[in-house]
Interface confidence: low
């Protein structure tokens, strides 16, 4: 037969096998022209595999409790005699009435996705049930599996979970929803509530519309041999043995321990469902039996141990040990002893492995002792306080506390501004602008170290130095920066912050604020000299507090213009001469001029300017400081907020006196006066004052 | 029978600390929380914080964190309340009271501080 | 910080008559844990310290007449005196202590007539 090439491409050509597992057929090509020697196509068959799935496919859980996978539940197994380790369970949907899980993993970790049937057979994939709030009897649960294992077709599978009261339980004698036994103080009388006896699960097996018209009757079927039964205060006997769960949760059953020992006690008792007007029903019923443990009263109570607060980062889980929680009592199990958490913290919940992902309010030192209970932090950064109450069951509860640090994962150190210290102090107080520690939110109790000293100065705590201190004593204003070198105007030091176990570095700048009065004023004029003096800068109070005369070394500027000496007369010889360092006395001799310039290489117009100057003072360090300025155009109309010593040239050719004064011409008359010598009479009193004196 | 017996009344200077002694005697020591509650005259009442005898852990009032300081000496079943920085404010009746966690079911006497310059 | 404010001020009862006293907190101070309001009442008299009266809003503390009980759940709490006795003249608070600062109503002064 011919098939042509398009065929094949098209996938039309199909092989069908029978006989033997090896063969094939013999085949030639041609273009229509040309033949090829013949080629043999080998084929070999393999066995088709197939999976199967054995097993009841069903688990009956008790509730509450772990029940491993069995084989009796999920066997599959392949044609191909495939290794169970090869087959592979894909869990599609899992449980919703609990969870899947590995013995061998983290029980706490996330869903399981998969497992093999090596797996099953170990025993080592757990169903386990989450007990709900409310009552049940019966529940009923499913997992959607999917069974691969290539080259086979995958296999879907439903497992279903019956999780029943019903169930013959080896963890869980009772079939009731509680049955935990009461105790009673020798001698004393007890109230059996649903907190330990309850079967609102057996009329939880009624539908809902139905349940308000039914009750559960306990029949009690062997009495107290040590006590008294009383409902609503009437004593249970042969020819009255009954009470209801409606009389249970009333809180109307106690019982009366008749002294004489401390012997236990307990009753047996037969409950069952009792329809409207109290019929007898179908449904579920047990008999069992309730314990009542009696203390003697002179017991020694148990005794809170000293505790270590828990520390984990948020978000994580960590478990609680005998550190957190412990009681020394000597006359009760680990199991007997019951804590109950009265208020919790907001950072977290208290959890039990095995006990459901939701938070506990109760457990027992059993539970503490095997690392069973833990803390699950949620996404709070603040510390918190579990206030618990402690009870062996005889003594009355106690107090206890268990304390929990939420530890940051990182802290940052905040450095909102540098120190300045006050020149004339030469010391100053830091506060949370110079030191604040954040993690995700602020860190009160931070605690700092210093890893780098400042080289001219000394961190005082109380007046003594310190390479320790907290934010709260920066808080309370308590640290002090304080020079000893009176050479620099500014220094530095490294502290270490540690803040709830984390740590991190910053450096601290120190700078010394000059002790100086400076007004600039007004816009000043461009090519006019003007007089500097303590109307403009003034380092009196300087001089003052340290009883000396205050230097000034100019550090910069002005970019346009110059700081000069003006002659103290016309006789004196010489113009004027560039200044770099000046005193207070200069300024108050009125010695000093300063040219402002006009700024080159662009249009006439408005500018800024300024200086720069490091005030030195005796037995203070230094400080450096600014004199910011504006400058424009001269305008003559205009009173200027300062003395001039001299206007431009142009300013004075339009005056018609040409050449009259030099433009750092002496002060005249109005130079010590302390207004402003031009604004008092505008321009021509300029004139007259400075030019024809 | 449950008694707690507090130190004597006190003038201090403001800006001076006191420190008040509360003795407890007739119960387990250890068992059970000492609060410290204060009444200036005639004004209600202000919780200032407790002591857990057992630990020596502490939790007090926000308002006088800082100033105030609890310590317990179990050898003598005493607890201490110290108040620093005090000021005219501070003046009241000081009160020691013991509590199953965070009702106060038995009180001291009471003992009065008077803060004047 | 949780407050607690109390009403009345004050009042006055003739012998015999019923008081109540109302206190309400600005949030709620039911556990829901354990189903418990943790709100307790004293009775204080003149020179003496306080005494408690009532725990977790309605448990009477032993040795309390059955004349005091407390009610009440969440933020609205009420305390009531039966046949008012001359003894009872004091001063009563409210006080929570549900979370830290515990802290108490501003007092209400029951006189008897």
């Known amino acids: 037969r011919t098939r042509s090439g398009s065929q094949l491409d098209g996938g039309l050509v199909l092989f069908s096998h029978r006989g033997t597992l090896d063969g094939g057929f013999r085949f030639r090509l041609s273009d229509g022209e040309h033949t090829s020697p013949g080629h043999f196509f080998r084929v070999t068959a393999q066995k088709q595999v197939l999976l199967s799935l054995k097993g009841s496919q069903t688990l009956t859980v008790c509730p509450g409790s772990v029940q491993p996978l069995s084989s009796q539940t999920l066997r599959a197994s392949s044609s191909a005699g495939t290794d169970p380790q090869l087959l592979l369970y894909r869990v599609v949907r899992g449980p919703q009435l609990g969870r899947l899980f590995h013995a061998q993993q983290d029980s706490t970790g996330e869903a399981l996705v998969n497992f093999t049937q090596a797996e099953v057979y170990a025993g080592n994939i757990l169903y386990e049930h989450e007990m709900p709030p409310e009552p049940f009897w019966e529940a009923h649960d499913t997992l959607e599996l999917q069974l691969s294992s290539p080259p086979a077709r995958d296999v879907a599978a439903t497992l279903a979970v019956a999780v029943s009261f019903e169930a013959a339980c080896p963890q869980r004698p009772s079939h009731l929803w509680k049955n935990k036994g009461l105790w009673v103080p020798e001698g004393q009388r007890a109230r059996i509530t649903v907190a330990a006896l309850d079967a609102s699960n057996l009329l939880a097996s009624v539908p809902s519309p139905q349940r308000s018209e039914h009750d559960v009757l306990f029949q009690v079927t062997q009495f107290p041999s040590r006590g008294q039964l009383l409902v609503s205060e009437e004593p249970l006997h042969a020819g009255q043995p009954h009470f209801l769960q409606s009389q249970l949760a009333a809180g109307q059953l106690v019982y009366a321990h008749g002294g004489g020992g401390t012997q236990q006690d307990g009753f047996h008792f037969r409950a069952h469902l009792q329809g409207p007007a109290g019929a007898s029903v179908a449904g579920p019923q047990t008999s069992e039996a309730f314990a009542i443990t009696v203390r003697d009263v002179n017991e020694r109570p148990p005794q809170p141990q000293a505790s270590v607060p828990l520390r984990l980062t948020r978000g994580s889980r960590a478990p609680i040990s005998r550190a957190q929680l412990s009681v020394v009592d000597p006359d009760s199990a680990p199991g007997e002893i019951e804590y109950e958490v009265q208020r919790a913290p907001h950072n977290g919940f208290l959890s039990l492995v095995g006990g459901g992902l939701g938070p506990v309010t109760r457990f027992t030192q059993a539970d503490v002792d095997s690392g069973r209970l833990a803390f699950v932090a949620n996404g709070s950064s603040v510390a918190g306080i579990f206030q618990l109450s402690m009870s062996d069951g005889a003594s009355p509860p106690l107090p206890m506390s268990l304390a929990v640090d939420i530890l940051p994962s990182a802290i940052e150190v905040q450095l909102r501004a540098p120190l300045e210290v006050p020149q004339a102090l030469g010391r100053s107080s830091l506060s949370q602008q110079q030191l604040r520690v954040v993690s995700d939110r602020e860190e009160p109790e931070a605690a700092y170290r210093l890893i780098q000293g400042p080289q001219y100065g000394h961190l005082l705590v109380g007046g003594r130095p310190t390479s320790a201190f907290s934010q709260f004593q920066i808080d309370q204003g308590e640290v002090v920066f304080a020079f000893t070198n009176s050479s620099s105007s500014h220094d530095h030091f490294r502290v270490l912050a540690l803040a709830r176990g984390v740590n991190a570095s910053a450096v601290v700048n120190v700078t010394v604020r000059a002790l100086l009065h400076v007004w600039a004023g007004g816009p000043w004029p461009q090519g006019a000299t003007l007089r500097l003096d303590p109307t403009v800068l003034d380092a009196g109070e300087l001089a003052n507090r340290t009883d000396s005369v205050p230097r000034f070394r100019l550090l910069e500027g002005p970019r346009h213009g110059r700081v000069v000496r003006v002659p103290r007369a016309r006789t004196e010889p010489g113009g004027s001469q560039l200044v770099e360092q000046f005193t207070q006395q200069d300024l108050e001799d009125g010695r000093l001029g300063l040219e402002v310039g006009r700024p080159e290489g662009r249009a006439p117009g408005p500018a800024g300017d300024s200086l720069t100057l490091e005030l030195w003072a005796q037995g203070v360090p230094p400080a450096v400081a600014s004199l910011d300025f504006a400058t424009e155009p001269y305008n003559a109309a205009r009173p200027y907020s300062v003395a001039l010593l001299s206007v431009p040239e142009a300013a004075r050719t339009e005056a018609g006196k040409p050449e009259s004064s030099t433009p750092t011409g002496e002060p005249g008359p109005m130079a010590s006066s302390p207004e402003p010598a031009v604004a008092k009479g505008g321009f021509l009193s300029f004139l007259e004052a400075n030019m024809f004196s | 029978q449950v008694q707690l017996v507090q130190s004597g009344a006190e003038v201090k200077r403001p800006g001076a600390s006191m420190k008040v002694s509360c003795k407890a005697s007739?119960?387990?020591?250890?068992?059970?929380?000492i609060h410290w509650v204060r009444q200036a005259p005639g004004q209600g009442l202000e919780w200032m914080g407790w002591?857990?005898?057992?630990?020596?852990?502490?939790n007090y009032a926000q308002k006088f964190q800082g100033r105030v300081t609890m310590t317990r000496d179990t050898s003598t079943s005493t607890v201490y309340m110290e108040l620093s920085s005090l000021r005219s404010e501070d003046t009241a009746v000081y009160y020691c009271a013991k509590s199953w966690v965070s009702w106060f079911a038995s009180w001291g006497q009471g003992t009065l501080v008077t803060v004047s310059s | 910080d949780i407050v607690m404010t109390q009403s009345p001020d004050s009042l006055t009862v003739s012998p015999g008559e019923r008081a109540t006293i109302n206190c309400k907190s600005s949030?709620?101070?039911?556990?829901?844990?354990?189903?418990?309001?943790?709100l307790a009442w004293y009775q204080q008299k003149p020179g003496q310290p306080p005494k408690l009266l009532i725990y977790?809003?309605?448990t009477r503390e032993s040795g309390v007449p059955d004349r005091f009980s407390g009610s009440g759940s969440g933020t609205d709490f009420t305390l009531t005196i039966d046949s008012l006795q001359p003894e009872d003249s004091a001063t009563y608070y409210c006080q929570q202590h549900y979370s830290t600062p515990f802290t108490f109503g501003q007092g209400t002064r029951l006189e008897i007539k």
């Open positions: 002591i857990n005898p057992n630990s020596g852990a502490t």
């Open positions: 949030q709620s101070v039911l556990n829901s844990k354990n189903n418990r309001n943790y």
């Open positions: 977790w809003a309605s």
């Open positions: 007739g119960y387990t020591f250890t068992n059970y929380y």
